[in-house]
């Protein structure tokens, strides 16, 4: 086949090689860009910048090599459109630095930067960490900083990500209140900061105020939905990004719902309780306190991370007619109490006509040290015989 006369020539089924001296000064309009998985560029001294627009449309790119060229600057967002990039070779260019943001979000198996006049500063602390942790084949390159010695020897004591402190109200927050949060940002070379409020939705009206180094956030007219929702403050500098999340506890009274008993492997009287702070619970059976044992006890389902409501069961193991009756769940917190009752019938009384039959509702010699109110948290399995029953 005749040699390819173009600046860039196909290489394999989805590769492109651009090696003709000085033919490129940008990567716009590369032929067949959308299907490329491999791009090899060499001897392009006019190619000095790599920016977001340069790699637009290269969504399938996995290997990018730009070597022995004039690359001086790679934009922090240069690889935004190439999320599948796994090998990046930028050796023997004119790079003095490379932002941590450039590689953030990529799963690079290999990053080659040897032969660049790197300048040791906190902006390369991330690369030093890669070297320390053996990532991306960096240690093998024995990277040097121009006139400063090995990257590995760069002092890094002062190279920290920003420090964040979020102040939340000490006092109890009630539904309808306005809440002021303040995020104090400290650190060198602060670049950007802000709030992430994606979880809040309709939980409050949001007003942002201030800027670095002190960001304010007012949550107006809060609802109980704000509970368990993360409010996150973030800040970035040349070393990296820091985030701190807080939650605002909005007090509201206990509420409770009971549902009809269902037979699974054991019997379950399903319930839901809500309230902030989390309510203490107590069960009554036919009006008397029900002492929990391994035969009858409260079992919570795994809670949803972002809501206060808890779902669970009063688990009854092998219940008989003596367990038939009225079950009441009492829930209380400092802001109110609630109760719900339900009748449950597990088995007909086989001795209905014999009033002499003993009914073992409880066995008095057992001392129950009930820490009633402490939630019994259900973990990741629903064991068949764990549970619960004769009253």
């Amino acid at each position: 086949a005749a040699p390819c006369p173009d600046a860039c020539c196909p290489h394999g089924s989805s590769g492109l090689r651009c090696t003709r001296d000085g033919a490129l000064d940008s990567l716009h309009h590369l032929p067949g860009a959308e299907n490329l998985t491999e791009l090899y560029i060499e001897n392009q001294q006019h190619l000095q910048h790599l920016e977001l627009r340069d790699l637009r449309g290269l969504g399938e790119l996995r290997n990018l090599t730009i070597v022995k060229s004039g690359l001086r600057f790679v934009a922090p967002d240069a690889f935004h459109f190439t999320p599948r990039l796994s090998r990046l070779n930028l050796s023997f260019n004119a790079l003095e630095s490379l932002s941590w943001k450039t590689v953030q979000g990529l799963s690079l198996q290999e990053l080659v930067l040897s032969g660049n006049p790197l300048h040791c500063s906190c902006a390369l602390r991330w690369l030093q960490r890669w070297e320390e942790e053996g990532l991306g084949g960096v240690p093998e390159q024995k990277l040097q900083c121009h006139g400063q010695g090995p990257l590995a020897h760069m002092p890094n004591a002062s190279c920290g990500v920003p420090t964040l402190k979020v102040q939340v109200p000490n006092a109890s927050v009630d539904v309808g209140d306005d809440v002021l949060l303040r995020c104090q940002v400290e650190g060198r070379g602060l670049e950007q900061a802000g709030w992430i409020l994606t979880e809040l939705e309709q939980s409050a009206t949001v007003m942002k105020s201030g800027g670095l180094p002190s960001l304010g956030l007012t949550l107006a007219n809060v609802t109980s939905d704000l509970n368990r929702k993360n409010v996150t403050c973030w800040a970035e500098n040349d070393v990296g990004r820091a985030e701190v999340s807080v939650q605002v506890n909005v007090s509201f009274p206990a509420s409770v719902q009971l549902h009809t008993a269902v037979e699974m492997h054991h019997w379950c009287i399903p319930f839901s309780v809500d309230g902030q702070p989390a309510p203490s619970l107590r069960w009554l059976f036919n009006g008397s306190v029900l002492n929990e044992t391994s035969f009858i006890f409260t079992e919570f389902l795994e809670p949803a991370a972002n809501e206060t409501v808890r779902h669970g069961c009063l688990r009854l193991n092998q219940p008989t007619h003596v367990n038939n009756g009225n079950y009441t769940l009492l829930a209380a917190n400092p802001f109110g109490q609630a109760s719900a009752s339900i009748m449950a019938a597990f088995m007909d009384n086989p001795f209905e006509f014999n009033p002499e039959d003993p009914i073992p509702v409880s066995f008095s010699p057992v001392d129950t040290n009930s820490t009633s109110g402490d939630p019994v948290e259900k973990k990741d399995e629903t064991p068949f015989g764990v549970s619960v029953a004769v009253g």
């Epitope: 492997h265 929990e292 044992t293 391994s294 035969f295 006890f297 193991n317 092998q318 008989t320 001795f351 039959d357 003993p358 073992p360 409880s362 066995f363 010699p365 057992v366 129950t368 040290n369 009930s370 820490t371 009633s372 402490d374 939630p375 019994v376 948290e377 259900k378 973990k379 990741d380 399995e381 629903t382 064991p383 068949f384 015989g385 764990v386 029953a389 004769v390 009253g391």
Partner: antibody, heavy 118, light 107 residues
Amino acid sequence: QVQLQQPGAELVKPGASVQLSCKASGYTFTSYWIHWVKQRPGQGLEWIGEINPNNGLTNYIEKFKNKATLTIDKSSNTAYMQLSGLTPEDSAVYYCAKYGNYVAFAYWGQGTLVTVSA
Amino acid sequence: DIQMTQSPASLSASVGDTVTITCRASENIYTYLAWYQQKQGKSPQLLVHNTKTLAEGVPSRFSGSGSGTQFSLKISSLQPEDFGTYYCQHHYGVPLTFGAGTKLELK
């Protein structure tokens, strides 16, 4: 697989206390109550009590109410039984046990032999 | 408490024999009864729960029966590994109680 690990033996003096451990593995610790059973040499089995690993709720048989104290360390998946004011009558093997898929003791520890002797 | 009374206290038999151990509850426990086998120096092992359900891995020569207050465990065609002490236990609420045991010895 489910395991309940107990130390083999404890030698204690009369009047002293001893804490027995039962380390659970192979299942979700907080999903099953832990029970303790006493067996004196050459004698039968005697249920002492039970504890809910989630919230520390305990039930004891009357005669062990002032003798045994059951506790839990969720962080290490370990149940403990403290026996106090020991007398020679407390010399026995103490087992921890848990229910299987039904309320019967499908899983037992190896037992800890407690010897009370001056 | 529910008292569990086991009989006989001891029993001698030969390999191949069939034996029956009985257990009486002081009150109605429906079918909530378990049987355990224990060998010298070992932990008890669950054989049967809910009167007649064999635990995992238990050979079919073991069978349980009964309800209410009267229960029995039958072992057909005794094997050398069957000798030991057998306990019944109710699982009808706490406190849980065991029978005093039946020692099955080789004749």
